[in-house]
Amino acid sequence: DTEIKVNPPQDFEIVDPGYLGYLYLQWQPPLSLDHFKECTVEYELKYRNIGSETWKTIITKNLHYKDGFDLNKGIEAKIHTLLPWQCTNGSEVQSSWAETTYWISPQGIPETKVQDMDCVYYNWQYLLCSWKPGIGVLLDTNYNLFYWYEGLDHALQCVDYIKADGQNIGCRFPYLEASDYKDFYICVNGSSENKPIRSSYFTFQLQNIVKPLPPVYLTFTRESSCEIKLKWSIPLGPIPARCFDYEIEIREDDTTLVTATVENETYTLKTTNETRQLCFVVRSKVNIYCSDDGIWSEWSDKQCWEGEDLSKKTLLR
């Protein structure tokens, strides 16, 4: 009874289509699959950035797989052929591993790459990234930003740079159609007559770096002798109400400070009849239902009530 063997896939490689970190892993079928032609061969693929402790594992019937990687580091991957037990009248048969690696040959020393890269998606409308030049680079050094996300045919270069002393230190992006809830890839490379400049790669999702506008139209309403309802409106723009969390800061008579986080555009505050002055500010942030992370907006303008008869007042800013 001869032992059943299967060969590993052929021509296993990692292909960089120029999407700044979104890579293709592809391979060809193993040789000598005739004995199993009535059977669907599967492939177990493992891959990771070099330095990562854990492998990502995929089992697929396809001859390719695509995923995003950090091109600041190398990538390693391995694959083998799987014959399910149905094909072999017994246990699963695996081939030996085929292995491959990929990395971008680094130019320049690490200190020449951009420092303190910071990207903010203002009000879910306008993306702005800024950075500082690398350490010890000369003024003739210029940095260029390229970006890609699924939906673009190819990586695009920034067309509206923010400059300081003639150097590019940021990018104002154009309208980015259908760009959220998917990986957004950025490369900032550079050129200098003096020395080579190290490229930097960044990946994030736009909905996770949103900084909304602050809430507007803050008002007070007396609900009862000991309750005041604070109300405000969602900021103008494309972010729906269901996506907001709010933080309120309330100051009573310049002494008591109340902070609260709420999900709605109202907050009921218990007060005493002795309250002479009430001020509050609100800020907004995209909540966990719409993103994994976010940036608090600036605080709204302060809205205050001063006087004796709060029951007769509905203040509108």
């Epitope: 052929q10 021509d11 292909v15 060809q28 079928p29 040789l31 000598s32 032609k37």
Partner: antibody, heavy 118, light 107 residues
Amino acid sequence: QVQLVQSGAEVVKPGASVKLSCKASGFTFSSYGMSWVRQAPGQGLEWVATISGGGSYTYYPESVKGRFTITRDNSTSTLYMEMRSLRSDDTAVYYCARRDLRSAMDYWGQGTLVTVSS
Amino acid sequence: DVVMTQSPLSLPVTLGQPASISCKASQNVDINVAWFQQRPGQSPRRLIYSASYRYSGVPDRFSGSGSGTDFTLKISRVEAEDVGVYYCQQYNAYPLTFGQGTKLEIK
């Protein structure tokens, strides 16, 4: 639709070099291996080179190994073959062909006639 | 190297009649065989891959069969546009090799 457009005919002297090109369109070029196949006048087909989608793997028969080099530029979707130390028996129509995902050749270019003659 | 031997080398056929071309491999190539048609003055055109699978757009009068070392291309009813040279090719192992070609002509 898939198209493979090859460069024009070449006439070269024995011992000379020439570089053929094949511009691809209508598919994700980097996902497919590519091959060159030649056909001497009145003869059958002879495989001369294959390159994998990412360019990591190249294959040649003994008859051209060391003289022919297959390369690709995925950024421009172009396949190349540089042929050095050409001999009269290298005279042929050279076809580029796409390797499908089962390793067979599914689409072919229109061919480039290379004539090696003194 | 795997030698692919085709027979016959010339195949005169009456229009509407069937035609069959044989291809024998010198060693086992499993089902890793393709068939191509080359009409006069044209580039080769794909017909069959993996011994028996027809490419899309290929008329169903073309069929392939076989595995291991013996392979066959059949045309159920020959039409005028089928005139040309037919090649088998193995892609089981490098170097890739073709048969010598079978010239199909109308009687």
